[in-house]
């Protein structure tokens, strides 16, 4: 902490401007009014303060707002956000998507920090659910965001938000997460026609049950092998050779290259050899 010292004559700050970069830490503490700083936070980012000087400015805001900063200040924190601890952020009440975007912008291009994770958690909990606009914003900054949520957290995602999800947003999701997301996607896309529906639902099929895969096999969808390989093992096992052939269409030949890998291996092992032979791929059960 900076010692309390009187501000030298003529140095009292009347506005937040570039002259302050020449102030020593103790001078900033003594000569910058916290209330002035709070009202002119938007100017701080335009001034090349040192990290030590930013520490002083943060300390002044902490003193002014011991219960947590108001959103009017939070929205303009800019690089000062990087000085905040998760404990600081837990005191905030962030409700504006613009505020969230402004702070995510500061951390752009970096891994999700504990500060950002705490900020997002506070924001989403404040909203009560992960709505489409929020999801759009978060996945734009962090494509892996959705898959960083627990199945319990994902259960608060309304089906309408699923429209914001891009295939790459699901790349790192595990089976338990897809189990939660798939029914939501099925509901979100239920009014689409066959081919359009398949394009949209494809990325979520790792959570699909057997009966849905059987239904898809009747629709000439021509599922690619990459999608098939992500299906739930327990959903694939009951499929007949004929159903898998219909499901994959021309891609069925790809089974040969994947015969040693799950879930293809598990499925092959449980088929009658006579049925496998009808594929003409030389698969051995």
């Amino acid at each position: 902490e900076v010692e309390k010292t009187a501000c030298p004559s003529g140095k009292k700050a009347r506005e937040i401007d570039e002259s302050l970069i020449f102030y020593k830490k103790w001078e900033l503490e003594a000569c910058v009014d916290a209330a002035l700083l709070a009202t002119q936070m938007d100017r701080v980012n335009a001034i090349p303060f040192t990290y030590e000087q930013l520490d002083v400015l943060k300390h002044k805001l902490d003193e002014l707002y011991p219960q947590g900063y108001p959103e009017s200040v939070i929205q303009h924190l800019g690089y000062l956000f990087l000085k905040m601890s998760p404990e600081d952020i837990r005191k905030w009440n962030v409700t504006s998507l613009e505020t969230l975007k402004a702070l995510l912008e500061v951390n752009k291009g970096h891994e999700m920090s504990p500060q950002v994770a705490t900020l997002i958690d506070r924001f989403v909990k404040g909203r009560g659910q992960l709505d489409k606009d929020t999801l759009d914003t978060l996945t734009a900054f962090y494509p892996g965001y959705l898959c960083s949520l627990s199945p319990e957290e994902l259960s608060s995602v309304p089906p309408s938000s699923i429209w914001a999800v891009r295939p790459q947003d699901l790349d790192t999701c595990d089976p338990r997460q897809l189990d939660v997301l798939y029914p939501k996607a099925r509901l979100a896309f239920q009014n689409m026609n066959g081919s359009e529906y398949f394009v949209k639902i494809q990325s979520f099929l790792g959570g699909a049950p057997t009966e849905d895969l059987k239904a898809l096999s009747q629709q000439n969808v021509s599922m690619d092998l990459a999608t098939f390989m992500k299906l739930r093992t327990d959903a694939v096992l009951p499929l007949t050779v004929a159903e898998v052939q219909k499901l994959l269409g021309p891609h069925v030949e790809g089974l040969k290259a994947e015969e040693r890998h799950r879930p293809v291996r598990d499925w092959i092992l449980r088929q009658r050899q006579d049925d496998l032979d009808t594929l003409g791929l030389g698969l051995q059960g």
Epitope: D174, R176, M229, T233, R260, H261, R262, L269, Q284
Partner: antibody
Framework: QVQLQESGPGLVKPSETLSLTCTVS??????????WSWIRQPPGKGLEWIGY???????NYNPSLKSRVTISVDTSKNQFSLKLSSVTAADTAVYYC???????????WGQGTMVTVSS | DIQMTQSPSSLSASVGDRVTITCRAS??????LNWYQQKPGKAPKLLIY???SLQSGVPSRFSGSGSGTDFTLTISSLQPEDFATYYC?????????FGGGTKVEIK
């Protein structure tokens, strides 16, 4: 509750064949969802998968042991067996049988049996 | 064969510590990754399957994460009974392979 029990000689001479049997109790070796594996662990070392069998008789072996391994299943006795030929001292290990449940992993193990290869 | 590399090979920790063990596959194995715990003279015990699913009866302080090639086993608060050796194992390829093991010892 499925239980597995390994049985077989604890001492085998070099160049001979190691033979072990695993008896399945409380469940069926003919289960649709299960594969039956053999895994070994040399003293003070890590785990090495030897191979598995499905009740249909389909097998799959560790490539490094394939030329010497045979795993078979006897559904009438609810058992599966391991044969490892041309053994050397390097085959000295604790041998485990294990159930490989298709939706999880090796969820049930035998208690293991120590096999020493020595003349 | 798919190689599984575990790190560290051993670690010392105290009761209450958060412990993280990593496992890396030489190629993508999707989520087909299991974790086992083994105590001296005993058979291994399945802790986590499919990368992140907790096996029935296993305490919730154990958790797993990851997909593709990089996986993590975390013990949120180490208990006296958790001092053991931990192994990862891939079941994606038909030739199953285990990691070399991580021995968790008392500091």
């Amino acid at each position: 509750q499925v239980q597995l029990q390994e049985s077989g000689p604890g001492l085998v001479k070099p160049s001979e064949t190691l033979s072990l049997t695993c008896t399945v109790s409380g469940g069926s070796v003919s289960s649709y969802h299960d594969l039956w594996s053999w895994i070994r662990q040399p003293p003070g070392k890590g785990l090495e998968w030897i191979g598995y069998i499905y009740y249909s008789g389909s097998t799959n072996y560790n490539p490094s042991l394939k030329s010497r391994v045979t795993i078979s299943v006897d559904t009438s006795k609810n058992q599966f067996s391991l044969k490892l030929s041309s053994v050397t001292a390097a085959d000295t290990a604790v041998y485990y049988c294990a159930r490989d449940f298709v939706l999880s992993g090796f969820d049930i193990w035998g208690q293991g049996t120590m096999v020493t290869v020595s003349s | 064969d798919i190689q599984m590399t575990q790190s560290p090979s051993s670690l010392s920790a105290s009761v209450g510590d958060r412990v993280t063990i990593t496992c890396r596959a030489s190629q993508s194995i999707s989520s087909y990754l299991n974790w086992y715990q083994q105590k001296p003279g005993k058979a291994p015990k399945l802790l986590i399957y499919a990368a992140s699913s907790l096996q029935s009866g296993v305490p919730s302080r154990f958790s797993g994460s990851g997909s593709g090639t990089d996986f993590t086993l975390t013990i949120s608060s180490l208990q006296p009974e958790d001092f053991a050796t931990y192994y990862c194992q891939q079941s994606y390829d038909a030739s199953y392979t285990f990691g070399g093991g991580t021995k968790v010892e008392i500091k």
